[in-house]
């Protein structure tokens, strides 16, 4: 019972995590304009992995996709790759884990086969979560580096009368969504791996009892033995569960308006 709960919870946590990774990857707010030096701006900039956007205080928002591959920074490409790998691995992991769930019966699948599938999906979730965390962290590091570089530039060469305010970017909502989602996927993966240990049947060593029949001897092993390699049938009736989990729609939280007072 505890194994089923651990497996089920691991699946749900991973599902939420992967939904979050997908949401974070699609979100436009990976980096948002830092308003510390200019809190009264009437134009707000924010950027995602796929496009950059400008929201005017009049309410109009214009987004432009990055219609180039070669012109983009290698780091951005790396982050995209990490997030996509995370999503793909997570999606495959979800597919595998659905069939591995103890509460779902598919044909005459052995518990040991389910254990292997649970372990496989768990490892996939762990790698998926690590990919997301790595991707978000690389992007965050890139932001921090650029932030301090632009800060250094901001305070040099300002001897003239004309002031040029350089746009600096800080952490956007997508980074936090990505970190949390990656963490959830990782935790879900660990839970699946723990559940796998409980699912794998312990190998019971029965002593073979020899019965001497006339003419030849036959070694008979009681039917209760199941090899750890996962052969043998499991005929117990199990409740069939459709596993129809639903992901919430992505909701983008926009930065609050910085009113001029």
């Amino acid at each position: 019972m505890a194994v089923t709960a651990c497996q089920g919870l691991g699946f749900v946590v991973s599902l939420i995590g992967i939904a979050g990774i997908i949401a974070a990857t699609c979100m436009d707010q990976w980096s948002t304009q830092d308003l510390y030096n200019n809190p009264v701006t009437a134009v707000f900039n924010y950027q995602g992995l796929w496009r950059s956007c400008v929201r005017e205080s009049s309410g109009f928002t214009e987004c432009r996709g990055y219609f180039t591959l070669l012109g983009l920074p290698a780091m951005l490409q790396a982050v995209r790759a990490l997030m996509i790998v995370g999503i793909v691995l997570g999606a495959i992991g979800l597919l595998v884990s659905i069939f591995a769930l103890k509460c779902i019966r598919i044909g005459s699948m052995e518990d040991s086969a389910k254990a292997n599938m649970t372990l496989t999906s768990g490892i996939m979730f762990i790698v998926s979560g690590l990919c997301a965390i790595a991707g978000v962290s690389v992007f965050a590091n890139m932001l921090v580096t650029n932030f301090w570089m632009s800060t250094a530039n901001m305070y040099t060469g300002m001897g003239g009368m004309v002031q040029t305010v350089q746009t600096r970017y800080t952490f956007g909502a997508a980074l936090f969504v990505g970190w949390v989602a990656g963490g959830l996927t990782l935790i879900g993966g660990v839970m699946m791996c723990i559940a796998c240990r409980g699912l794998a049947p312990e190998e019971t060593n029965y002593k073979a009892v020899s019965y001497h029949a006339s003419g030849h001897s036959v070694a008979y092993k009681p039917g209760g033995f199941k090899a750890s390699t996962g052969f043998g049938s499991n005929t117990k009736n199990k409740k069939i569960y459709d596993g129809g989990a639903r992901t919430e729609d992505e909701v983008q939280s926009y930065p609050s308006k910085h009113d001029y007072v």
Partner: antibody, heavy 118, light 113 residues
Framework: QLQLQQSGTELVRPGSSVKISCKAS????????MNWVKQRPGQGLEWIGQ????????KYNGNFKGKATLTADKSSSTAYMQLSSLTSEDSADYFC???????????WGQGTTLTVSS | DIVLTQSPSSLTVTAGEKVTMSCKSS????????????LTWYQQKPGQPPKLLIY???TRDSGVPARFTGSGSGTDFTLTINSVQAEDLAVYYC?????????FGAGTKLEIK
Amino acid sequence: QLQLQQSGTELVRPGSSVKISCKASGYAFSNYWMNWVKQRPGQGLEWIGQIYPGNGDTKYNGNFKGKATLTADKSSSTAYMQLSSLTSEDSADYFCARYYRGNCFDYWGQGTTLTVSS
Amino acid sequence: DIVLTQSPSSLTVTAGEKVTMSCKSSQSLLNSGNQKNYLTWYQQKPGQPPKLLIYWASTRDSGVPARFTGSGSGTDFTLTINSVQAEDLAVYYCQNAYTYPLTFGAGTKLEIK
């Protein structure tokens, strides 16, 4: 077509208050910021502030904080500006204007002339 | 606050001439996010409210004659009227649309001989 119709000329005593109206028609009033601009006789334009009728959000020019109060009535598609503690310095033409793409004022009211005199 | 300095304060021209007026900003009005300059030009004829001519420094509003052209970037902007008409007699204002408070230039008064 799109129109911003402002209330008529006002002649008031110093120290009193006045409420100028701007009735919008021909567009979704709640979805656009409404701005107020002051123009003293023979002078330039001065932005007072803006209100978003959809939720009542306001932004003010610091010079007019405490002087002007912006409100809006969605049901009648009308924006209001109340000016308090009036002095001769407040004698001017006041325009309402819709805020549009590019953070510009694309449609303007015909203006309300306020004269503060004892 | 951003200060906009317009020059000249007034100019008199003959119909058909080309006119240029300047607007200088105390801060850059160029937004790096979309590479657009948040400067607007308005025309105010005597006894009328201002009328939008150009936004984003160079985008003409619908219905504005092609003889009106906005140019410039960062802190220096220009409004050009090719072949001035008698009906162009007005005061022309530039406006900062980049930072609150939204500010206007003092205006350039165009007079026709």
